[in-house]
């Protein structure tokens, strides 16, 4: 099966790699602009230079292109706890991330919020905190895992989901005569 190509992809595929078809004359292939630049004017004829101009401050192009405008630099979302890892340059967008000991939670494909990694107090680290995943904790005896925090079984009330997790401790409190039974 031949994949469906958009008009722009169809036009570009007529020319060799690194070139694009002139929008007004499909017999002319113009050289694409380098990253960090954008298309100011198409090449006037075969073998003639494309007029490419450098992106202005606050904009970029990250790959060779024939865009009429550079792309606007992304801004890190402070309200999401994001910090700037590296600034925008003419050929690379801003890189945003989280602070040390934080992980990312993505609300959408491109939007993430930073959350503090769990410290596993009253437990041990089973898996360390990663860029997109919180620490995985294993709780000490007498504690249960609640939203990745180890909480004392004394806070576990009947009918809550912690009862199974705290059951061994509850049984131990009853006395030694029950400890040998299954």
């Amino acid at each position: 099966l031949v994949p469906h190509l958009g008009d722009r992809e169809k036009r570009d595929s007529v020319c060799p790699q690194g070139k694009y078809i002139h929008p007004q004359n499909n017999s002319i292939c113009c050289t694409k602009c380098h990253k960090g630049t954008y298309l100011y004017n198409d090449c006037p004829g075969p073998g003639q230079d494309t007029d490419c101009r450098e992106c202005e401050s606050g904009s970029f192009t990250a790959s060779e292109n024939h865009l009429r405008h550079c792309l606007s630099c992304s801004k890190c979302r402070k309200e999401m706890g994001q910090v700037e890892i590296s600034s925008c340059t003419v050929d690379r967008d801003t890189v945003c991330g989280c602070r040390k000991n934080q992980y990312r939670h993505y609300w959408s494909e491109n939007l993430f919020q930073c959350f503090n990694c769990s410290l596993c107090l009253n437990g041990t680290v089973h898996l360390s905190c990663q860029e997109k995943q919180n620490t995985v904790c294993t709780c000490h005896a007498g504690f249960f895992l609640r939203e990745n925090e180890c909480v004392s079984c004394s806070n576990c009330k009947k009918s809550l989901e912690c009862t199974k997790l705290c059951l061994p401790q509850i049984e131990n409190v009853k006395g030694t005569e029950d400890s040998g039974t299954t």
Epitope: R104, H105, W107, F115, K132, Q133, R146, E147, N148, C162
Partner: nanobody, 120 residues
């Protein structure tokens, strides 16, 4: 067994308001981030808003900021979404969901949904 039951959807004119509710049971409601996810006809799921267990932290999608307000009543195990200045593009099935933090976008455990129609 976890249960999330949404209500409050309906037909509203552009510029109108609706208040969605979600009654939760089968888990300790106040321990969890909760939120609202929507799915418009022919489109994917998207997080609209979310709120931390204590209610101290919230998230809003850019498209609803300033128009929608999320809140919760932990004593009633109920989540709310007040939707004002509704637009045609807000029409969707709205689901109440438990948020699973980390990675994503993931849509956690969801209810059956309530339909919001915005039309004149």
């Amino acid at each position: 067994e976890v249960q999330l039951l949404e209500s409050g959807g309906g037909l509203v004119q552009p510029g109108g308001s609706l208040r969605l509710s979600c009654a939760a049971s089968g888990f300790t409601f106040e321990w969890y981030w909760m939120g609202w996810v929507r799915q418009a006809p022919g489109k994917g799921l998207e997080w609209v808003s979310a709120i931390s267990g204590s209610g101290g932290s919230t998230y809003y999608a850019d498209s609803v900021k300033g128009r929608f307000t999320i809140s919760r009543d932990n004593s009633k195990s109920t989540l709310y979404l007040q939707m004002n200045s509704l637009r045609a593009e807000d029409a969707a099935v709205y689901y109440c969901a438990k948020v699973k933090l980390g990675g994503g976008p993931n849509f956690g455990y969801r209810g059956q949904g309530t339909l919001v129609t915005v039309s004149s």
